[in-house]
């Protein structure tokens, strides 16, 4: 049998059954999530669930830039350090940079400090690049 690899929308990249779109526009976290959702197919800000997935994403983004942090789909909606993925994925894999999680920082970004392999918390109203993900 021939198994066809699903196709992603133009410009989105495919990895392990998912499509990813890297948006080089400035949005706060909630606006970024709304923009991801607008693409349908169950798209959300990206969940990153393994080191392999993190490495693939980091390598892709580093081909564009190495300085700007990028919103992902991890947030702390209750503001109690109870982090969860907006797409409902289980919060098992963690890659925090180790910086302080205090203050009014309840949304997660991929940090450029470690080539996008680690995450930092930031204020959700900051306008940043963002990464969307969906399963085709």
């Amino acid at each position: 049998d021939i198994i066809m690899r699903p196709s992603c929308a133009p410009g989105w990249f495919y990895h392990k059954s998912n499509c990813y779109g890297y948006f080089r526009k400035l949005r706060n976290w909630s606006d970024a999530e709304l923009e991801c959702q607008s693409y349908g197919n169950g798209a959300h800000l990206a969940s990153i669930l393994s080191l392999k997935e993190a490495s693939t994403i980091a390598e892709y983004i580093s081909g564009y830039q190495r300085s700007q942090p990028i919103w992902i789909g991890l947030h702390d909606p209750q503001k109690r350090q109870q982090w969860q993925w907006i797409d409902g994925a289980m919060y098992l894999y963690r890659s925090w940079s180790g910086k302080s999680m205090g203050g009014n920082k309840h949304c997660a970004e991929m940090s450029s400090n470690n080539n996008f392999l680690t995450w930092s918390s930031n204020e959700c109203n900051k306008r940043q690049h963002f990464l969307c993900k969906y399963r085709p």
């Epitope: 929308a9 410009g11 080089r24 526009k25």
Partner: antibody, heavy 124, light 109 residues
Framework: EVQLLESGGGLVQPGGSLRLSCAAS????????MSWVRQAPGKGLEWVSA????????YYADSVKGRFTISRDNSKNTLYLQMNSLRAEDTAVYYC?????????????????WGRGTLVTVSS | FMLTQPHSVSESPGKTVTLSCTRS????????VQWYQQRPGSSPILVIF?????PSGVPDRFSGSIDSTSNSASLTISGLQSEDEGDYYC?????????FGGGTKLTVL
């Protein structure tokens, strides 16, 4: 009021050189990236080169790389384009434009102000 | 990649016209798109930035949008006026470079 005034255009033979200048006023010149955009007679717009506000980063279109050099003097609020090894296909009106701001592969801000342009004609 | 625009468009005064700008590869949605108006004999003027934002002084008859399905950006001008006649260029970013569309000549009949 933002003003950009280009000068230095003219007729030059193929293989020759020319230096364009752009005098800027009405904004804090050193805070903004600047660009050169050209338009061949009857044709569309073509981005040529850009430089960061500090002058530390420069960018070029493939068509001019190695022949053109962009620079700026923030003490004089002036942008320059040194054009060497000129070819007939470089004939165009050259516009000085404010913006966009690019760093490490990421660009923001549009070309929000343009000069009137200066005509460069490369012909024997 | 390239940005492709129709060579020319004509419409009557008072009508609405939509100019398109199609990206050949990569997603039109990933980077901001700008639109510039160039009246005959004049320098370009910014009319839309960041996909759909209007600079101060540009009338609200001008609006921009992005359609990811067709991978294109659009500039819509309503209540067309004779002074809208000219060339319109879309522009986006490619790494540290700037890419312009070939331009659309808008004629107000």
């Amino acid at each position: 009021e933002v003003q950009l005034l280009e000068s230095g255009g003219g007729l030059v033979q193929p293989g020759g050189s020319l230096r364009l200048s752009c005098a800027a006023s009405g904004f804090t010149f050193s805070s903004y990236a600047m660009s050169w955009v050209r338009q061949a007679p009857g044709k569309g717009l073509e981005w040529v080169s850009a430089i960061s506000g500090s002058g530390g980063s420069t960018y070029y279109a493939d068509s001019v790389k190695g022949r053109f050099t962009i620079s700026r003097d923030n003490s004089k609020n002036t942008l320059y384009l040194q054009m060497n090894s000129l070819r007939a296909e470089d004939t165009a009106v050259y516009y000085c434009a404010k913006g966009p701001d690019c760093t490490n592969g990421v660009c923001y801000l549009p070309f929000d102000y343009w000069g009137r342009g200066t005509l460069v004609t490369v012909s024997s | 990649f390239m940005l492709t625009q129709p060579h020319s468009v004509s419409e009557s005064p008072g009508k609405t016209v939509t100019l398109s700008c199609t990206r050949s590869s990569g997603s039109i949605s990933f980077d901001y798109v700008q639109w510039y108006q160039q009246r005959p004999g004049s320098s370009p003027i910014l009319v839309i930035f960041e996909d759909d934002q209007r600079p101060s002084g540009v009338p609200d008859r001008f609006s921009g949008s992005i359609d990811s399905t067709s991978n294109s950006a659009s500039l819509t001008i309503s209540g067309l006026q004779s002074e809208d006649e000219g060339d319109y260029y879309c522009q986006t970013y490619d790494d540290n470079r700037q890419v312009f569309g070939g331009g659309t000549k808008l004629t107000v009949l």
